[in-house]
Structures are given as C-alpha cells and as structure tokens.
C-alpha cells in the first residue's frame, strides 16, 4: 500500500513542480524576452537593430505613375476639365545606400545620421523606358506665376514665357519630369536662379537629414524616435503643433507595440508628422504583423477633426479650410505651389477633383500601410503612397494662363513606395525571434498542462486508493 | 560694367518731336527691359515709359499715352523714347533705367529736355 | 494707380542722428517697395528693395521695413555723406509710382 500511495504522491508532487516551473516561466520567459528584445533592438554597434538600421536589407521600390494630359489645349483655351490617363508603374530601387554619418552621442543617448538618396530604374520592373515622354502641367510656368502674384513681374514673366514658346502645358521624357531639366523659360532670366525643374530634382547624390534619433540605451521606449531633424525639433511650416517632428521616421518604432497604440511618425516627403492606427492582424511570411493604416481622419477638413486647423493654411484654395484631402506644402518647397495628396485623391473632398477627369480612388491600391512586428516594432512591409500635385491658377497678366476661369490643383503623378522582408531575412527573424518565442510559450504550455494534468490525475488517483483503503 | 547713356536732350518748341536714346553696354536691354523716367526741376520722379523684355508689351504713363513711343534696338543694345506733340510740363530730366522686377539697380546719368518757346 | 505718400517731406538732422522716413500706399502692395536715394544734379541710386533687402555696396546703416501699404526706410546713424533726398518706389503694379521725396537737410 505504501510503495503505491508513495507512487502515486510522488506523480502528483512532479505535476506540481512542473505545474509550478510551467506558471513561473511565463513571467520570467516574458523577462527573458524582453531583456533580449531590449538588448537587440538598441541602435548601438553590434545590435541587430543597428545592422538592419545602417543599411536595408529589404529591397525598396519606388513604383511611379505618371498622369498623361489627354487635352491640353482644351484646357488652356477653354478652362475644360484636365483629362489624364495614368500611366505606369516606372520601377526605380530606392534607399539602398547606408546611412552616412552616424555619430553615437552617449551624453543624451542619441545616434546622428544622414539618409542618403539614390534611385536606379528597373527597366524589368517598368512598362516603359526613362525616355517616354507626357504630356504633364509646365512645372516652371505654374511655379513662376504662383511665387510671384506680382502684376508688374507677371508682365515681364510673360515676355519671357512667350519669347521661350513656353506653355501652359508642356512633353517631357520621366527622366526630365522626375529627376530635373533645364527649363527654357527660367533661362531666360537674367539673373543668377536654379534653371533645373524637376519633380524630385535634385535628389542623387543628395542626402535627407540630419535625423537624431533616440538610440534607446537609457530607455528602450525611445528607441528610433526623433529627437532633432536638421537640428531643429520643429519644422517651421506649420502653426502650433501640426509643426511637432513626432516620432519615428516609421522604418521601426519603439518595441512591444500594443494594437491599442497610434503609430506617430515624421514624413520629410510630406513635410509633416502624421500617424497610424491598427486595422488587422497579418501573416506575413510566418510571421504575425500588425497592419497598421495611414486613417481618412489624418487627411480630414478641420471641420471634420478640429486638431487638423493648423495644417490648413490659407483660405482660399482650401474654400475657408472646407477642403479635405490636400495638404499645401509650399512653406516646405521654397514657395512653389505643391499638393500633396492620396492617389487619385483618395479621401479628398470632392471639389478638389472636379476639375480633373480621370481619376479612380481605390482604397486597396491607394492607401498607405504599415506591417509592425509587434515584439520588435521592426516595420517588415510597407506601402507609402502618395501623389504630388502643382497648383495653377488664371492669370490676366501671363497670356497662357489668362483664358483659365478657375484654380486647378493638377495631379503630376503618384508613387508607391515598396518593402518587404526577403524570404532569407524572414527566416532568419522567424528562427530568431518568433521561432524562439513561439517555443518558450510551447514550453510553458506543456509543462504547466501536463504538470496539471498529472498533479490532478495522481491526486485522483491517491484518493481513490485511500478511500479504498480505508473502508 | 554696366552703363547706360542717354542722349538726345535739348530745347524743342511746344508741339514739336524729340528723340532721346539710351545707349546700355554690360547687359543685354532685351533680357531686362528698359523704363524711362522723368524728373521736373524741383520736382520729384515720375515713371514715364517701359518696354518688357525680349519686344515685350509697352506701358506708359497715362500723362503721355498716345505722344510717346518707347522702342529698343537689340543690334545696337539701345532703347528709345519717341516724344511726339511735347508740352511745357513736359519739361525734365529724362533717365533711362533697367529693371527686371520693377526696382531700379541701374540708371544713366539724365538728359535734359526743355519745352519753350 | 497707386499713390505713394511719403512723410515728412522734409527733416533736419545731426549727424549721429537716427533718422525714419515712412511711406504709405494707398493699396497693398505686399513687400514690393523699394527705396532710392538722389544727391542734387545725379541720377538715383537703389538702396533697398523688397521692402526689406539691402541693395549691394550700401551700408548697412540703412535698413526698410514694413508689409501691405505701411513702409519705413530707417538710417541708424545719419552720416555727412547721407545728406539728400529719398524717394520710396512700389515695384507691384504698372504704373510704377513713386512718393513725392523726403529731404534730409543738416540741423
């Protein structure tokens, strides 16, 4: 009778400890972890973070369609509608140089760096070649006349616009539009100005900074987020807060990232900081991702979210801050009259695009997105889209614009901007991170479930036999 | 260096014709446009005439539109003022100027034109 | 047309002297005013542009400010040299017109 009861007291007593051992390793695997996360994601030498961080390992894409005027002289005769015809994708590879400059500043725990830009066409990638030519707005001419309101200097940009047969619309090849040519009009005049236009002109060979992040050695809840850009911690575009750099520059963001979180973000391409909300959960190549979206909200009127005031500026194109959609960057490029948008215009009001022809929002194609480990807070996939528009107005100084009857906000073109975690790299993070995070919580659960499971069953079964023993 | 001279000035009978020239040497007058301006003695400036660039519109003072006739000949890098039909308050001293944005940078040194008889 | 008013018309003062000039437009002109300063039997010579810009060569004793129709043309230290009129110009619209001139006279 003893050596069984004693059996049987020793099973349950090995439950319990298992039990037990299963119970206190979910907080100390937990501690595990995040000492482990904590450690690896700091951007310092010889993290992994700060591998991945210094140079990409996922390949970036920078997908171009370029809006086609279809009726060009209709609209400058007749002030019609702008019919564009979309045309794309031109693939170029983006962001592929290492960060340059990175200086570790140990007093405030902040790593300096600059952001190098190149681009390389992928012609595999492409429905074109570089040399096709549009049929887009006359960068120059909309610029000119919106930077000088001036009647007087609108006369004499007018001789010049006339003397170089400049128009109000103009054909260029998408190496001219995107990366810069010489523009005839602005030769023309007789001081020392930039005569190169160019969507993203001057970009290779230029570099986006300086950025001074947080390298998260005194407090991992910092880490990635922006402490300065350009030595400011403000833009200088925008009234009140709208001119915060909040953030991180969305590559990554601090670890353990909660769905109830709102991802806050700096854009230099948009000149703002903006944010995004959970929307689902994802699988990405084994992977779980929290798909994180870029809200119509961010994009409202101030009538409609009142904390977007400041990112209205003036009042007229805006029809007193009722538009939504739009954001007026001049302050941010040198007083040129630039829009930036959804695509298509994607969650604008639709004054904004009656004026053009064309256009078909999709919320699956035009959205922006992006997909967070949650444990790392490592952005593994992401789509930034975007589209860049010029305003142009009538005027009744400068002949190619005097037939115009109201402001066109004219779409050039729209980006989407790719990564994705490569299957090598997903593997790796998978063996690494939630391969060994998948199999501590494995282990917990096997060793508390069976240690329960046993501690009950031979407590059954040792009542059982005393029972029996008794009577 | 950039110079402008004018030339042309003098006595002229009220009703009569008077052309002044304005010489430019160390820029091109049709890159910038040329105005004339006029100063009455004791008096203060007066814009009178501007030619745009490269043959662009002319504009002139309403005080005389439809007497004076600005010009530029780009071959002699010169621009001129054709004074038709000219008045006692017509009296001044004419200057040439180049402009681009409406300001001044540059102006000759002045040619008196008097209206007498 | 846009009509310039220049005041005072005229002002004594010493050299040292810290000498304003104001200017008035009868419509918004932005920043578009410039200023020009004529010694007797010469021509005009630029000192400022866009209301604020000091032209090239000249001293920064001088200095303009102001936006919309109220301008001023400020010298900080009035010298020998800076004896003469001045004249503020509105480069926003044809007709150009200028003010009637202020003269800086020695006390």
């Known amino acids: 009778g003893c050596d069984r009861n004693c059996g049987l007291i020793t099973g349950a007593v090995i439950g319990a400890v298992l039990a037990v051992f299963g119970g206190i390793l979910m907080p100390v695997g937990d501690m595990l972890i995040q000492k482990t996360i904590k450690k690896e994601v700091v951007l310092e030498e010889g993290t992994i973070a700060f591998k991945n961080w210094v140079k990409t390992g996922t390949e970036i894409y920078r997908q171009f369609w370029i809006f086609d005027v279809q009726n060009p002289q209709e609209v400058m005769m007749n002030s019609s509608n702008i019919q564009v015809k979309q045309r794309g994708p031109y693939t170029y590879r983006v962001r592929f140089l290492a960060k340059e400059n990175i200086t570790q500043d140990p007093k405030d725990n902040t790593v300096s760096f600059l952001q190098p830009n190149g681009a390389i066409f992928e012609p595999s990638l492409s429905v074109g070649t570089e040399a096709d030519n549009f049929t887009v707005l006359n960068l120059a001419v909309a610029a000119a006349s919106h930077i000088y309101p001036n009647p007087f200097v609108q006369v004499v940009l007018n001789s010049l616009i006339n003397k170089s047969k400049s128009s109000m619309f103009q054909v260029r090849t998408l190496r001219e539009l995107l990366w810069g040519y010489t523009d005839p009009f602005l030769s023309l005049v007789p001081y020392p100005v930039s005569t190169r236009v160019g969507m993203f002109y001057p970009y290779n060979n230029t570099a986006d900074g300086v950025y001074k992040v947080f390298n998260g050695k005194d407090s991992i809840s910092k880490v990635a987020i922006i402490d300065t850009y350009k030595g400011k911690r403000n833009l200088s575009y925008w009234e009140s807060y709208c001119d915060m750099i909040n953030g991180t520059d969305a590559a990554s963001f601090p670890p353990f990232v909660e769905k109830s979180q709102v991802l806050q973000f700096f854009s230099s391409d948009i000149c703002r900081s903006i944010y995004a909300v959970f929307e689902s959960d994802v699988n990405l190549k084994g992977i779980p991702v929290y798909r994180f979206v870029l809200p119509s909200k961010a994009f409202a009127s101030p009538v409609q979210n009142p904390d977007n005031h400041c990112f209205c500026t003036e009042k007229i194109i805006s029809k007193n801050c009722t538009s939504y959609g739009v954001l007026d960057i001049s302050k941010c490029k040198e007083g040129k009259p630039v829009y930036i948008s959804l695509p298509h215009f994607l969650y604008a009001s639709p004054d904004v695009s009656e004026t053009i022809d064309g256009l078909n929002p999709n919320e699956e194609e035009h959205r922006t997105y992006l997909d967070i480990e949650p444990i790392t807070g490592f952005t593994l996939q992401f789509a930034k889209r975007l589209q860049v528009n010029l305003l142009v107005k009538p005027s009744n100084k400068i002949q190619v614009l005097k037939r115009l009857k109201r402001n066109y906000i004219v779409p050039i073109l729209w980006l989407n901007e790719t990564g994705t975690i490569g299957d090598e790299k997903a593997k790796m993070f998978r063996s690494q991170v939630t391969g060994k995070i998948n199999l501590l919580g494995l282990i917990e659960m096997i060793l508390l479930s069976v240690g329960v499971v046993m501690f009950v069953a031979f407590m059954i079964s040792y009542c059982a036999c005393r029972s029996k023993t008794i009577k | 260096e950039v110079q402008l001279v004018e030339s042309g000035g003098g006595l002229v009978q009220p009703g009569g014709s008077l052309r002044l020239s304005c010489a430019a040497s160390g820029f091109t007058i049709s890159s910038f446009g040329i105005h004339w301006v006029r100063q009455a003695p004791g008096k203060g400036l007066e814009w009178v005439a501007w030619?745009?660039?490269?043959?662009?519109?002319?504009y002139y003072a309403d005080s005389v539109k439809g007497r004076f006739t600005i010009s530029a000949d780009t071959s002699k890098n010169t621009a001129y003022l054709q004074m038709n039909s000219l008045r006692a308050e017509d009296t001044a001293v004419y200057y040439c100027a180049r402009s681009f944005f409406g300001y001044f940078d540059y102006w000759g040194q002045g040619t008196l034109v008097t209206v007498s008889s | 047309d846009i009509q310039m008013t220049q005041s005072p018309s005229s002002l004594s003062a010493s050299v040292g002297d810290r000498v304003t000039i104001t200017c008035r437009a009868s419509q918004d002109v932005s920043n578009w005013v410039a200023w020009y300063q004529q010694k007797p039997g010469k021509a005009p010579k630029l000192l400022i542009s866009y209301a604020t810009s000091l032209y090239s060569g000249v001293p920064s004793r001088f200095s303009g400010s102001g936006s919309g129709t109220d301008f001023t043309l400020t010298i900080s230290s009035l010298q020998p040299e800076d004896f003469a009129t001045y004249y503020c110009?509105?480069?926003?619209?044809?007709?150009?017109?200028f003010g009637q001139g202020t003269k800086v006279e020695i006390k």
């Open positions: 030619i745009a660039p490269y043959g662009g519109d002319e």
């Open positions: 110009q509105q480069h926003s619209n044809a007709p150009l017109t």
